[in-house]
């Protein structure tokens, strides 16, 4: 999916009002410096591409994020504010339902959510200094 035509300000508002708090709740008890940055993004569409990938694509050691509260709210925000996004996700959602497993918070998941926090911060960053 190409995130170029999303309403970035509306997505930013959704992040600031709820998604950010849900990410903090998930990470509670973890030091903010515990994980180094291992993923970045270079503009708002790119950030959403990487956020979608980390949030909804199962990875080795962390297959369970898609059912977390922050993930469901992320999915809702993208569906509302990114034209045509929900249509592209129907097949992915069906596959996810078949895969649904017991919820386990692993260290790998904590690391992944830490990276998500970093990506969201970059998405919401103010303009850099004029170089």
């Amino acid at each position: 999916y190409d995130f170029t035509n999303c309403d970035f300000e509306k997505i930013k508002a959704a992040y600031l009002s709820t998604i950010s708090k849900d990410l903090i709740t998930y990470m509670s008890g973890t030091k903010s410096t515990e994980f180094n940055n291992t993923v970045s993004c270079s503009n708002r569409p790119h950030c959403l591409t990487e956020i979608q990938s980390l949030t909804f694509n199962p990875t080795a050691g962390c297959a369970s994020l898609a059912k977390e509260m922050f993930a469901m709210k992320t999915k809702a925000a993208l569906a509302i504010w990114c034209p045509g996004y929900s249509e592209t996700q129907i097949n992915a959602t069906q596959a996810m339902k078949k895969r649904r497993k017991r919820k386990v918070t692993t260290n790998k998941c904590l690391e992944q959510v830490s990276q998500l926090q970093g990506l969201w911060r970059r998405f919401n960053r103010p303009l850099l200094k004029q170089q």
Partner: antibody
Framework: QMQLVESGGGVVQPGRSLRLSCAAS????????MHWVRQAPGKGLEWVAV????????HYADSVKGRFTITRDNSKNTLNLQMNSLRAEDTAVYYC???????????????WGQGTMVTVSS | SYVLTQPPSVSVAPGQTARITCGGN??????VHWYQQKPGQAPVLVVY???DRPSWIPERFSGSNSGNTATLTISRGEAGDEADYYC???????????FGGGTKLTVL
């Protein structure tokens, strides 16, 4: 653990070519801009080239433009520097480094390799 | 092209504060990054975006930037701080990275 490992350095005659490689591991390579920086013996750091996170744009220092080519392969997590028409003044330790970027602005180089020595001598 | 000017050397007594400057035309409008390099080793980022510090760098390292001068401040200097220090910016007008000439810090 995040790591950059350079290879390909060595001794080469003036006018000849050399290809350096940088293998990245421990981070999502395709999301970072990547640089080559060099340091001549006893001298300071000199920036050589940068390639965008997706390979869509490239910039070179004036001293190497037209002779050096920076490339990346995001499927293999590798960065390369093809060095042609080498000169004695290209003798240096060559480092690769990663850099987050925002739009067309490159940020700090937060991870560096250990460097590979290139000596251009007849 | 944009030029960054650093003093070749700075010395500090153990426990005292060292300040390394980096001069450039209206450098306060740019984001400045600082690197530490010890002999035979690769550079290490110590301060980025003028004053931010990577999580692995001690709080003794800090930075500031305004007008025509950026400054790296190292408080309570230690023997282990002896190294070369480089400032760096991204120059959008030329699409080039620019490094300062480097400053050798000596802890007396």
């Amino acid at each position: 653990q995040m790591q950059l490992v350079e290879s390909g350095g060595g001794v080469v005659q003036p006018g000849r070519s050399l290809r350096l490689s940088c293998a990245a591991s421990g981070f999502t390579f395709r999301t970072y801009g990547m640089h080559w920086v060099r340091q001549a013996p006893g001298k300071g750091l000199e920036w050589v080239a940068v390639v965008w996170y997706d390979g869509s744009d490239i910039h070179y220092a004036d001293s190497v433009k037209g002779r050096f080519t920076i490339t990346r392969d995001n499927s293999k997590n590798t960065l390369n520097l093809q060095m042609n028409s080498l000169r004695a003044e290209d003798t240096a330790v060559y480092y690769c480094s990663r850099s987050p970027q925002w739009e067309d602005i490159f940020e700090s180089m937060d991870i560096w390799g250990q460097g590979t020595m290139v000596t251009v001598s007849s | 092209s944009y030029v960054l000017t650093q003093p070749p050397s700075v010395s500090v007594a153990p426990g005292q504060t060292a300040r390394i400057t980096c001069g450039g035309n209206n450098i306060g409008s740019k984001s400045v990054h600082w690197y530490q390099q010890k002999p035979g080793q690769a550079p290490v980022l110590v301060v980025y975006d003028d004053s931010d510090r990577p999580s692995w760098i001690p709080e003794r390292f800090s930075g500031s930037n305004s007008g025509n001068t950026a400054t790296l401040t190292i408080s309570r200097g230690e023997a282990g701080d002896e190294a070369d220090y480089y400032c760096q910016i991204w120059d959008s007008s030329s699409d080039h990275v620019v490094f300062g000439g480097g400053t050798k810090l000596t802890v007396l």
